[in-house]
Interface confidence: medium
Amino acid sequence: MAERAALEELVKLQGERVRGLKQQKASAELIEEEVAKLLKLKAQLGPDESKQKFVLKTPKGTRDYSPRQMAVREKVFDVIIRCFKRHGAEVIDTPVFELKETLMGKYGEDSKLIYDLKDQGGELLSLRYDLTVPFARYLAMNKLTNIKRYHIAKVYRRDNPAMTRGRYREFYQCDFDIAGNFDPMIPDAECLKIMCEILSSLQIGDFLVKVNDRRILDGMFAICGVSDSKFRTICSSVDKLDKVSWEEVKNEMVGEKGLAPEVADRIGDYVQQHGGVSLVEQLLQDPKLSQNKQALEGLGDLKLLFEYLTLFGIDDKISFDLSLARGLDYYTGVIYEAVLLQTPAQAGEEPLGVGSVAAGGRYDGLVGMFDPKGRKVPCVGLSIGVERIFSIVEQRLEALEEKIRTTETQVLVASAQKKLLEERLKLVSELWDAGIKAELLYKKNPKLLNQLQYCEEAGIPLVAIIGEQELKDGVIKLRSVTSREEVDVRREDLVEEIKRRTGQPLCIC
């Protein structure tokens, strides 16, 4: 017993040591070494049956969905899927895990967030990190050069998520992508149109779509004097401009990231600008930027993009923002991100955007990474951040104290007297066969009041009441739960009457 206590103390101390090293940002090797020691000690300790230490919970960064949350989720998915289909997309699915090799080298610094699986019969596997890389692998594997597809599925990231803000380790992504060689900016404009259509339909508040181009970023950093090795890290600083002032961003770039102050100043001149097509035109006149081939290409494409966005009627939702610098390594052209606009109590207390609710861009080189001959398939796409949207919709409904129906039942088959279970079973079966969503209470002789109460709680609009008299007369009493008005309906007309009242098509097409 004393031996166990001593071991427990060692585990505690070693745990504190590991935490300390992590806080001090010690080297990965040292941390790994100390973690291994900790695991060894824990293994020595073994299970302790005397202590019921197991806490019943979902793993970190995951959650269960209640029927209420699922109802919200299905409504959101319905809006998204209808929009994707309206734009002519097909649907695909891919495995939840991929060969580790498929995902390696596609995400830059974010690769450390990939979940690796333990050995599965020789293959090194990882859970998918997004839906884009598996899509590129699918195109290369099937030698496809042309497809417009959507894919809604869960992805996995070993992040430290702020779940209150709708961030998780397991979460849904809703992706729409167009692959193929097309005239410039037409598919890109459609992706932005889709993004705006979905966010408008969801009615989650005012939003803005920031647009930039990877080539403009590359060109801008090149003429400002940022070395290739610093590109990624400077991008991540610049990307904070929507949350903090330029002063703070500059301090980070110079103080923490070793950028020369004059280089930072040159970057500041560019990234503190946003606007519409007029800013694109202004930058096309810029003596330095217009001399950079990459930047010039990007600006030319953005000018064209704005023309199409105007034709699509969404140019007022788009802001060309030179500080938009986030994104994965695979983007090659236009990048965009939709942010919800909020109203902080005081300026400077918190950022304007509650965070990205959708993002996307052009990635012309990703499929080529999987092709033995390096053949490229140009792609552009978008991803809707549904988890964040679920959180927003849930919060809004809670604030409005709105009741959400968690079932779609149209009618409850009820009885007013005892000994009518057989009749209820016969009737509910008739309704099911006719495509009516119907329920009954699982009791032989339920009280009518209990049946009506169940309808009110579940939001079921109609009750079909069977009584002895009704059986003799060949009718069913159809009662509206909200108005409480009752009518006798001939049994053969019941299906049609329920469909008429609930707005369901009269044939199951």
Partner: antibody, heavy 120, light 107 residues
């Protein structure tokens, strides 16, 4: 605290020139875009020009393009507006303001203004 | 250029009143809008940015709303120091244009 003080205004004949200055204090001048905004007597406000933190970037309203030049000296914490070929319609109070990019382009701090009168 | 139109051009009100000023943009500007207050012989003072965000130090009786092309500035309970001219300004694209102003006078 943030302070902006304009100077250099006065009476000038049409076709003449004038140079306005704005002395800034209370913040890291070189980290901010700066702007000139004007207001004709009894009229509304008009954004004239802006300049980026390190002098590289300038922009002008069409009404002054080719005639006005905005510049700055970060070592002296000063902003300037060189006004050439002045016209009657340039008569206004000229304000210098700190232009804040974060969230929207706005003037979050303004000077008290200097009056420019163009008249023969 | 984006045109900004304010209404009314002047309004008379009493201390304690609720006042609303409207600003319309000739094209959609999302939430890229600011409101300023200007007193005679003084520089404008920033009240609201991003259509509805209150500038630090500005009393909470001032609030802004709207997006796209239609915006409002509301003063929930007028104070003696609020009598001034109010301007809206679009910040979507340069040249950043102002409304013609709304003069708030004592009734």
């Amino acid at each position: 605290q943030v302070q902006l003080v304009e100077s250099g205004g006065g009476l000038v004949k049409p076709g003449g020139s004038l140079r306005l200055s704005c002395a800034a204090s209370g913040f890291t001048f070189s980290d901010y875009y700066m702007t000139w905004i004007r207001q004709a007597p009894g009229k509304g406000l008009e954004w004239v020009s802006y300049i980026s933190g390190s002098n590289a970037y300038t922009n002008y309203a069409d009404s002054v393009k080719g005639r006005f030049t905005i510049s700055r000296d970060n070592a002296k914490n000063s902003l300037y507006l060189q006004m050439n070929s002045l016209r009657d319609e340039d008569t206004a109070v000229y304000f210098c303001a700190r232009y804040v990019y974060q969230v929207v382009a706005i003037g979050d701090y303004w000077g008290q203004g200097t009056l420019v009168t163009v008249s023969s | 250029d984006i045109q900004m139109t304010q209404s009314p051009s002047s309004v008379s009100a009493s201390v304690g009143d609720r006042v609303t000023i409207t600003c319309r943009a000739s094209q959609g500007i999302s939430s890229w809008l600011a409101w300023y207050q200007q007193k005679p012989g003084r520089a404008p003072k920033l009240l609201i940015f991003a259509a509805s965000s209150l500038q630090s130090g500005v009393p909470s009786r001032f609030s802004g709303s709207g997006s796209g092309t239609h915006f409002t500035l509301t003063i929930s309970s007028l104070q003696p120091e609020d009598f001034a001219t109010y301007y809206c300004q679009q910040a979507k694209s340069f040249p950043y244009t102002f409304g013609q102003g709304t003069k708030l006078e004592i009734k």
